[in-house]
């Protein structure tokens, strides 16, 4: 025979073809072998011109031989070489599908691989590719879009060889709150790490606000609106600064009275105050908390105390906010001026969390009277808020 070629090569099959011998022959003897693969020999009829090779090993170079037989006579042997394809990974599956994450798992191919190419594409045409190592059989997809159809494909790699792609289709779950109006809604969307988040006042995407969310204290979901921790930020600021907010949300900061008014106008909120000093901790929770608008000079409502710090905020309930340049307190003197801070002063304070950091002079420092009195400036303080019905929302989400 002559003109031995292989066609239709896959990872486990190939088709051998040849030109028949000019003379009539009884049979053809076909043999094929590969590295680490024992030789297989087959005899076929003399009028056959092709033979399907099956049960081949993937990604293997085979040597194929064929000769003709007529009675006791044998023709010369002709030879061809071919390499089987790399077989594909198997059983690609998307599990643990959330609004922005999913876990892809697969079974490895039979052939050894040098890695895998993962491609995932959303219906809007956004394509991402990632190459993972040869021992990997799962990959966590992140930063997906909620409520979106995705096609995920995987291909095995072995040097220059690439397997066929296999694919799976999945749909991310919709966010409970596409435009979370506070940290509790961000948490109910599945975000459980404390840090910076964007919230949308009244769920309006045009009213974006970057906030620090405390996702750990007492179940999480808190918007932190004040933090004192090291004295690097100046809190002896004017009315305009306290209305707008100032500082670094990751460090010491004040979120702003206008923002507090807008947030607490969204529903019923609770206040939590966390205090820390030389290894001691205390907290206060008030189940009703709101801040009025600029017309009321950001009047404070705080009721329903529980906790370990003592009820020092009650003294300030119903008071307007005061700064050194806008004196709204009930004292003849200017409390903000006298105590170098700003607060919902009365005459003057039980709480002075915006006082002078580290100042242990009477009433000048970061004070919470019923915990450390007025002659001890507290090292760490945070004020934070979340919806009063957060526990109910959280329970509903868990049941869902």
């Amino acid at each position: 025979p002559s003109g031995l070629v292989t066609a239709n090569i896959t990872d486990s099959e190939a088709l051998a073809r040849w030109q028949p011998a000019i003379a009539t022959v009884d049979s053809y003897v076909i043999s094929y072998t590969g590295e680490k693969v024992p030789e297989i020999t087959r005899t076929v009829s003399g009028n056959t011109v092709e033979y399907a090779l099956t049960d081949l090993e993937p990604a293997t170079e085979y040597t194929l031989r064929i000769f003709a037989e007529k009675g006791p006579q044998k023709s010369s042997t002709i030879t061809a070489k071919f390499t089987t394809d790399l077989d594909s990974p198997r059983d690609l599956t998307a599990t643990e599908v959330q609004s922005e994450t999913a876990l892809l798992t697969w079974r490895p191919p039979r052939a050894s691989v040098t890695g895998y190419l993962l491609v995932y594409e959303s219906v809007d045409g956004t394509v991402k590719e990632v190459i993972v190592g040869p021992d990997t059989t799962s990959y966590s997809l992140a930063d997906l879009s909620p409520s979106t159809h995705y096609t995920a494909k995987i291909q095995a790699l072995n040097g220059p060889l690439r397997s066929n792609m296999i694919q799976t289709i999945f749909t991310t779950i919709g966010l409970l709150y596409p435009f979370p109006k506070d940290c509790s809604q961000a948490m109910l969307n599945g975000d459980t790490t404390s840090g910076l988040y964007t919230i949308y006042l009244n769920g309006d995407k045009a009213e974006a606000l970057e906030v620090f969310c405390d996702m750990t204290s007492d179940g999480g979901g808190w918007i932190v609106f004040l933090r004192r921790k090291n004295g690097r930020e100046n809190f002896y600021q004017n009315w305009k600064a306290y209305a707008a907010g100032f500082g670094d949300r990751r460090e010491e900061f004040w979120l702003g009275l206008d923002n507090l008014n807008k947030i607490t106008a969204q529903g019923q909120y609770e206040l939590r105050v966390d205090l820390r000093d030389h290894g001691e901790t205390a907290f206060a929770v008030y189940d009703k908390f709101s801040v009025g608008d600029a017309k009321t000079r950001y009047k404070l409502k705080v009721e329903g105390y529980s906790g370990t710090a003592g009820d020092s905020m009650a003294y300030h309930n119903g008071r307007s906010f005061s700064t050194f340049d806008k004196d709204t307190d009930s004292a003849i003197t200017n409390c903000a001026l006298s105590y170098k801070g700003a607060f919902w002063y009365r005459n003057c304070h039980r709480v002075n969390l915006m006082g002078r950091y580290g100042d242990n002079n009477h009433s000048q420092g970061v004070n919470w009277f019923h915990w450390k009195g007025h002659e001890h400036s507290i090292q760490f303080a945070e004020m934070k808020l979340r919806p009063s019905n957060f526990r109910n929302l959280e329970g509903r989400r868990k049941r869902a």
Partner: antibody, heavy 120, light 107 residues
């Protein structure tokens, strides 16, 4: 309008007990802290004890600590002062007073008082 | 405990005169100071709280001032119905304490 009516005073021997009551009306009782203040005959005012609106926090003057107990029943709009181990120096007119807020702050509105006389 | 010292103990004053009563706290109390008026056989009545805030219904001739440790109650023009005993009281910390009283009587 706010009304506070004290009762339970009387003549009692030293070492004995007495329970004073204060019936409140005209305001949401559990929204306000309450106080007991006394005045010995011909003398000045002495703050005795106080209790927060919820009843969760109680406070006492050193002179009565360990002998007197303040309590309240918000369902009955009533304030109480249980006085044990009474002494002659506890003889006074006892006033109940409503605070301006839910915590120890300013005794704002006072009742007319009930007289306690400790004598053998 | 915080001691409250009032002066004078007695203040004979003619009707129409200005009256000034002072009160000193034994320690710093910000503005946590209140003034009461007591007439014979009657319960005390709150006049001023937070050192300077006039209680509802109290005539404007009464005023309070001061901060920290030193406080003053002023009656700008003494009226016949103002003859009474006046007490200062600190509400800064418990136990709350009263001054010993100042008796304003007719001169």
């Amino acid at each position: 309008q706010v009304q506070l009516v004290e009762s339970g005073g009387g003549l009692v021997q030293p070492g004995r007990s007495l329970r004073l009551s204060c019936a409140a009306s005209g305001f949401t009782f559990d929204d306000y802290a309450m106080h007991w203040v006394r005045q010995a005959p011909g003398k000045g005012l002495e703050w005795v004890s106080g209790i927060s609106g919820s009843g969760g926090s109680t406070y006492y003057a050193d002179s009565v600590k360990g002998r007197f107990t303040i309590s309240r029943d918000n369902a009955k709009n009533s304030l109480y002062l249980q006085m044990n181990s009474l002494r002659a120096e506890d003889t006074a007119l006892y006033y109940c007073a409503k605070d301006i807020s839910a915590v120890m702050d300013v005794p704002q509105t006072w009742g007319q008082g009930t007289m306690v006389t400790v004598s053998s | 405990d915080i001691q409250m010292t009032q002066s004078p103990a007695s203040l004979p004053t003619p009707v129409g005169d200005r009256v000034t009563i002072t009160c000193r706290a034994s320690q710093y109390i910000q503005g946590f100071l209140n003034w009461y008026q007591q007439k014979p056989g009657k319960a005390p009545k709150l006049l001023i709280y937070d050192a300077s805030n006039l209680e509802t219904g109290v005539p404007s001739r009464f005023s309070g001032s001061g901060s920290g440790t030193d406080f003053t109650l002023t009656i700008s023009s003494l009226q016949p119905e103002d003859f009474a005993t006046y007490y200062c009281q600190q509400s800064y910390s418990t136990p709350q304490t009263f001054g010993q009283g100042t008796k304003v009587d007719i001169k």
